[in-house]
């Protein structure tokens, strides 16, 4: 907190410019008019104020706007944004995508800070949903953004926004998140033809149910092993050897290298060894010939 002192004669700032970096903290407090600062915020970003000087400028704005800054000021905060606390940001009403972009630019190249997370949360809540333009912007700055949302938050993403999602945006998503995103992607891409559809849907397949995987196996998609390994185990288990062979196409040979890992390991345990042998890959661990397979889950469902 800077002490209140009178501004020395001739030091009253007529405008926000570089000469202010020579002011001591108390001089900035005494000689810079808060209303002038608010109207000329766009200049602050170009002036190499020290960390401590920015504290004083923030204090002046806080006094001028105790209920929270107007968007006209927020949009031009520049590096002063880095001084804001999540509590400060919760007072804001940010509606313009341009404002969001301007503030994300300030933090560019750094991890998502609590300030940025709060800003994004305020912005998305204000809009009511995560629309395509917002998602485009957020994933451009933070590729992992989508996967940082809870399944509940993801449920507010409209299918039309899925077009903005790139494969790398889903790298850190867990199965619960993909369970929410997959049906949206399926809806978004439903009018595309087979091969184009597969290219788009591929990164979302970690949320696909068995019946959709069966359908894909009829379309010569040649799924790569990396995608196959990310599929839900419960969705893979019911697939037959023939269906997996069709689904993977030439990539089926990769199953051998993954036979000890899920979901391949669990899938092998469910297949007849005879059927596995037809692949010619030397996969072991299937059900020996002559054994009867009881589907206990079906039995429980009937009783």
């Amino acid at each position: 907190e800077v002490e209140k002192t009178a501004c020395p004669s001739g030091k009253k700032a007529p405008e926000i410019d570089e000469s202010l970096i020579f002011y001591k903290k108390w001089e900035l407090e005494a000689c810079v008019d808060a209303a002038l600062l608010a109207t000329q915020m766009d200049r602050v970003n170009a002036i190499p104020f020290t960390y401590e000087q920015l504290d004083v400028l923030k204090h002046k704005l806080d006094e001028l706007y105790p209920q929270g800054y107007p968007e006209s000021v927020i949009q031009h905060l520049g590096y002063l944004f880095l001084k804001m606390s999540p509590e400060d940001i919760r007072k804001w009403n940010v509606t313009s995508l341009e404002t969001l972009k301007a503030l994300l630019e300030v933090n560019k190249g750094h991890e998502m800070s609590p300030q940025v997370a709060t800003l994004i949360d305020r912005f998305v809540k204000g809009r009511g949903q995560l629309d395509k333009d917002t998602l485009d912007t957020l994933t451009a700055f933070y590729p992992g953004y989508l996967c940082s949302l809870s399944p509940e938050e993801l449920s507010s993403v409209p299918p039309s926004s899925i077009w903005a999602v790139r494969p790398q945006d889903l790298d850190t998503c867990d199965p619960r998140q993909l369970d929410v995103l997959y049906p949206k992607a399926r809806l978004a891409f439903q009018n595309m033809n087979g091969s184009e559809y597969f290219v788009k849907i591929q990164s979302f397949l970690g949320g696909a149910p068995t019946e959709d995987l069966k359908a894909l196996s009829q379309q010569n998609v040649s799924m790569d092993l990396a995608t196959f390994m990310k599929l839900r185990t419960d969705a893979v288990l019911p697939l037959t050897v023939a269906e997996v062979q069709k689904l993977l196409g030439p990539h089926v040979e990769g199953l051998k290298a993954e036979e000890r890992h899920r979901p391949v390991r669990d899938w092998i345990l469910r297949q007849r060894q005879d059927d596995l042998d037809t692949l010619g890959l030397g996969l072991q661990g299937g059900i020996p010939n002559g054994y009867l397979v009881l589907d206990l889950s079906m039995q429980e469902a009937l009783s």
């Epitope: 570089e18 970003n45 170009a46 002036i47 190499p48 104020f49 020290t50 960390y51 920015l54 520049g78 590096y79 002063l80 880095l82």
Partner: nanobody, 116 residues
Framework: QVQLVESGGGLVQPGGSLRLSCAAS????????VAWYRQAPGKEREAVAV???????KYADSVKGRFTISRYNAKNIAYLQMNSLKPEDTAVYYC??????????WGQGTQVTVSS
Amino acid sequence: QVQLVESGGGLVQPGGSLRLSCAASGSIFSGNAVAWYRQAPGKEREAVAVITRDGDTKYADSVKGRFTISRYNAKNIAYLQMNSLKPEDTAVYYCNTARGAAVDSWGQGTQVTVSS
């Protein structure tokens, strides 16, 4: 992370001159103002000179007429020519841009000692 390296300091007699250099690792100078600051023992860091991206210069009253700031954007270097040095100019000198100063990220500085 932008790295700023200051050099050119040393021990000089009152009335002498030094030329400080500031080299940046990224191409950050071209679109930004660059400033020189100094910090004497037990005192607050203070700005002594600034050059805008357009080349306009401003100086603290205490160094006006003695110090000259300049920049060479193509090489990402800024300079501070210091003439008629006084004992009160003794300090560690730093250069920075708006981004660096705002996040309190500084180079190691260069020591200037003015003494007979």
